[in-house]
């Protein structure tokens, strides 16, 4: 079950809760946002506060890292497992240091098997960062500082750090360096969102977050 | 293919103001940034400033900074940089070059021909 | 701002021959580093970027390597339309900066 099912189920308080997959007894823990545009929405990424190292592996992007009340990334498995048994939209807001924020809802999302690298999938942009989707379309493959599956003769992931769906590499990576107030300027391997904030900008806080469709 | 073409030659006074442009086609202009560089004669390369072609944001070198202004005109694809108060060391050729600025990525290809700025009572 | 220095200056080398430039940086760069030929006379021209990847068009005698502070331009097999000025250049930070160049003839 999805925080959406756990909303349903009346709980509707922010927090962490316990989810699983359907058919499946694996128990992930992710944070549940029961407040913003209806609640039911389960949280994938947040960054924050740079507590968290994001320069990670293949194997750790895949099942997820961090922590569910502060900054982590639930996981590429799930996610895929999660996104291929019904519709979910994606929601990704963010926030800049002068205290403006911003979000991309895409009305249909999904990632692709691990052995399709995760490849993400996303229709129908909306929202206020950017009339571009700062994740290139159509979908890249996901890659991680030890599996380079971009479409640049250089290595993204290790130029610009983290994981993400890089093209060549693209207009946004998420998962950058966090740098704090006053050195978050001119970084080229910061929390970029291109269409929203333009380059060498590095932001202060994302969320992704991602909800069924029909809820 | 991705071209830049820059404006003439130029020939200046001391204390003159000079504005090149830089006409771009073959790409995407908001996906991209400008570097202008110069070469003074005989010489290496000296970077001015940057300017985005989606916001038009800039960042200038210290050495230039309140002299240089870059400019960019989307609905022509085409990049400006203007120096005042000219003096006869800033005689140069002055080129402008793409980036990828969307991928943050500072490498500079392909350039413009260049523009000689003479400088000169 | 970001110092880079190259070596040499200059350098004199027969066709055949592989010509080595390095490029020092002050202060690290990670692999944010390129490398341009310049003829006398045209616009410089992009080589390698992101330190050792080769820009698509470019001779693969040509290569890159090096991260951090120590970075190298091989020539392997130097023709003779390898002549010209080599400048590093890094994409680290702004201000962007050059290497002073080297300058490779023919003998």
């Known amino acids: 079950r999805d925080c959406a099912e756990v909303f349903k189920s009346g709980h509707t308080t922010n927090g962490v809760y316990t989810l699983t997959l359907p058919n499946s007894t694996e128990e992930v823990k992710a944070y549940c946002d029961m407040e913003a545009g209806g609640g039911g929405w389960t949280i994938i990424q947040r960054r924050e506060d740079g507590s968290v190292d994001f320069q990670r592996t293949w194997k750790e992007y895949k099942v997820g890292f961090g922590n569910p009340s502060g900054e982590y990334w639930l996981g590429n498995e799930f996610v895929s497992q999660l996104t291929n048994q019904q519709r979910y939209v994606l929601k990704i807001h963010l926030k800049d240091w002068e205290g403006n924020e911003a979000y991309s809802l895409y009305e249909h999302f999904y990632l692709s098997s691990e052995e399709l690298n995760y490849r993400i999938h996303l229709k129908g942009l909306t929202g206020t960062a950017g009339k571009i989707s700062s994740i290139s379309q159509p979908g890249n493959d996901f890659s991680t500082k030890d599996a380079d599956n971009d479409k640049c003769i250089c290595k993204c992931s290790q130029m610009l750090t983290g994981g993400w769906w890089f093209d060549a590499c693209g207009p946004s990576n998420l998962n950058g360096m966090y740098y704090p107030q006053r050195q978050n300027t001119n970084k080229f391997n910061g929390i970029k969102w291109y269409y929203w904030k333009g380059s060498g900008y590095s932001l202060k806080g994302t969320t992704m977050m991602i909800r069924p469709a029909d809820f | 293919q991705v071209q830049l073409v820059q404006s003439g030659v130029e020939v200046k006074k001391p204390g003159a103001s000079v504005k090149v442009s830089c006409k771009t086609s073959?790409?995407?202009?908001?996906?991209?940034?400008f570097s202008w560089v110069r070469q003074a004669p005989g010489q290496g390369l000296e970077w001015l400033g940057w300017i985005s072609g989606y916001n038009g944001n800039t960042n200038y070198a210290q050495k230039f900074q309140g002299r240089v202004t870059m400019t960019t005109d989307t609905s022509t694809s085409t990049a400006y940089m203007e120096l005042r108060t000219l003096r006869s060391d800033d005689t140069a050729v002055y080129y402008c070059?793409?980036?990828?600025?969307?991928?943050?990525?500072?490498?500079?290809?392909?350039w413009g021909q260049g523009t000689l700025v003479t400088v000169a009572s | 701002d970001i110092q880079m220095t190259q070596s040499p200056s200059s350098v004199s080398a027969s066709v055949g021959d592989r010509v080595i430039i390095t490029c020092r940086a002050s202060?690290?760069?990670?692999?944010?580093l390129a490398w341009y030929q310049q003829k006398p006379g045209t616009a410089p021209k992009l080589l390698i970027h992101?330190?050792?990847s080769l820009q698509t068009g470019v001779p693969s005698r040509f290569s890159g390597s090096g991260s951090g502070t120590e970075f190298a331009l091989t020539i392997n097999s130097l023709q003779p339309e390898d002549f010209g000025t080599y400048y590093c250049q890094q994409a680290n930070s702004f201000p962007l900066t050059f290497g002073g160049g080297t300058r490779v003839e023919i003998k």
């Open positions: 073959g790409y995407t202009f908001s996906n991209n940034g």
């Open positions: 992101s330190a050792s």
């Open positions: 202060q690290g760069l990670s692999s944010w």
């Open positions: 070059a793409r980036d990828q600025d969307y991928s943050n990525f500072h490498w500079l290809d392909p």
